[in-house]
């Protein structure tokens, strides 16, 4: 039985230019977690994150995305174009998997405020 | 056009160390991981370690984990297996392996090096 | 450590027809599972990856499927060119293993 929960940032939002900390937390389970996968949007690959092999990182991110802090992700140098929805899938052992749900704005104004909060999506 | 170029065959005796160089061409080598795979005369092939050319961080299989050492050169992009303490059952071909885009696979190999152990 | 079988050992087809290559893996691994060809005296060539996406350049009559612990490469109309020696290998822990191998050849 799946007794998990996913805990996220949530809706986020960061300033052009800068750099944001995609973050997702399992809990209430004992699970080993042996995977964290990040995708973007368009469920494209952003990076995995092996309990064994470590980190890979999609090559066409690897200069603008750096692995953690922790299973989660940094994202740098942000442009309009990473704003929409970011996952991350936990897969664990023996429970199977869990799935979490982050929004991220990137506003062009000088006085976006990175707000980020832990919520369950 | 993605090429991975394996240094020449060897000849060690037993208890002598090797290092395999495997030269990448045909893309941004730091943004690719390198993979070393070794194949036993007849035999199947075997997964020895990983490397991250941009940070060099490795991981490596167990069973190898004493014996060798991955790195890599940045400026001639350049990846390097060194396998130590040589025994008879290290005769094999040697190859290096490109990760791919989406995961820990490999999407190119080198053309692959034989060493020979033998006294 | 993850452990890979592959079955059938070998297999002769005739041109034309399909050859069906069966990989099962010791414990769940979802989706990550490749294949590779491996022709004599050749490097292992990528044909599939993420049990079912079909690497750059490899022709359609190849196809892979499954999920969990069990896997099959398809090449649906054999072709000469792909006499080699197939190899699945799964790409989620440490070790990566790869199975055995299977030998396909002409009938």
């Known amino acids: 039985m799946m007794t998990g929960t996913i805990e996220t940032t949530g809706n986020i939002s960061a300033k052009k230019g800068g750099s944001v900390i995609l973050q997702c937390h399992l809990s209430s389970t004992m699970a080993q977690v042996t995977q964290v996968n990040w995708e973007q949007h368009d469920h494209s690959l952003l990076a995995i994150r092996n309990a064994e092999l470590g980190w890979h990182i999609y090559p066409a991110f690897k200069d603008r995305v750096a692995p953690g802090p922790g299973l989660g992700l940094t994202l740098q140098s942000l442009t309009m174009n990473d704003t929409g929805e970011y996952f991350c899938t936990y897969h664990t052992y023996p429970d199977g998997t869990y799935r979490g749900r982050i929004f991220l704005e990137v506003l062009e104004s000088s006085v976006a405020e990175h707000s980020a909060r832990f919520q369950i999506p | 056009e993605v090429q991975l170029v394996q240094s020449g065959a060897e000849v060690k005796k037993p208890g002598a160390s090797v290092k395999v160089s495997c030269k990448a061409s045909?893309?941004?080598?730091?943004?690719?991981?390198m993979h070393w795979v070794r194949q036993a005369p007849g035999q199947g092939l075997e997964w020895m370690g990983r490397?991250?050319?941009?940070?060099?961080?490795?991981k490596y299989n167990e069973k190898f984990k004493s014996r060798v050492t991955i790195t890599v050169d940045k400026l001639s992009s350049t990846a390097y297996m060194e396998l130590s303490s040589l025994r008879s059952e290290d005769t094999a071909v040697y190859y290096c392996?490109?990760?791919?885009?989406?995961?820990?696979?490999?999407?190119?190999w080198g053309q692959g090096t034989t060493v020979t152990v033998s006294s | 450590d993850i452990v890979m079988t592959q079955s059938p050992d070998s297999l002769a087809v005739s041109l034309g027809e399909r050859a069906t290559i069966n990989c099962r893996v010791s414990?769940?691994?979802?989706?990550?599972l490749a294949w590779y060809q491996q022709k004599p005296g050749q490097s292992p060539k990528l044909l599939v990856y993420?049990?079912?996406t079909l690497a750059e350049g490899v022709p359609d009559r190849f196809s892979g499927s499954g999920s969990g612990t069990d896997f099959t490469l398809t090449i649906s109309s054999l072709q000469a060119e792909d006499v080699a020696v197939y190899y699945c290998?799964?790409?989620?822990?440490?070790?990566?293993?790869f199975g055995p191998g299977t030998k396909v050849d002409i009938k």
């Open positions: 392996a490109r990760e791919g885009h989406y995961g820990f696979y490999s999407d190119y």
């Open positions: 290998q799964h790409h989620y822990g440490n070790p990566l293993t």
């Open positions: 490397i991250d050319p941009d940070s060099g961080g490795s």
């Open positions: 993420n049990a079912k």
């Open positions: 045909g893309y941004t080598f730091t943004n690719y991981y």
């Open positions: 414990e769940n691994i979802y989706s990550y």
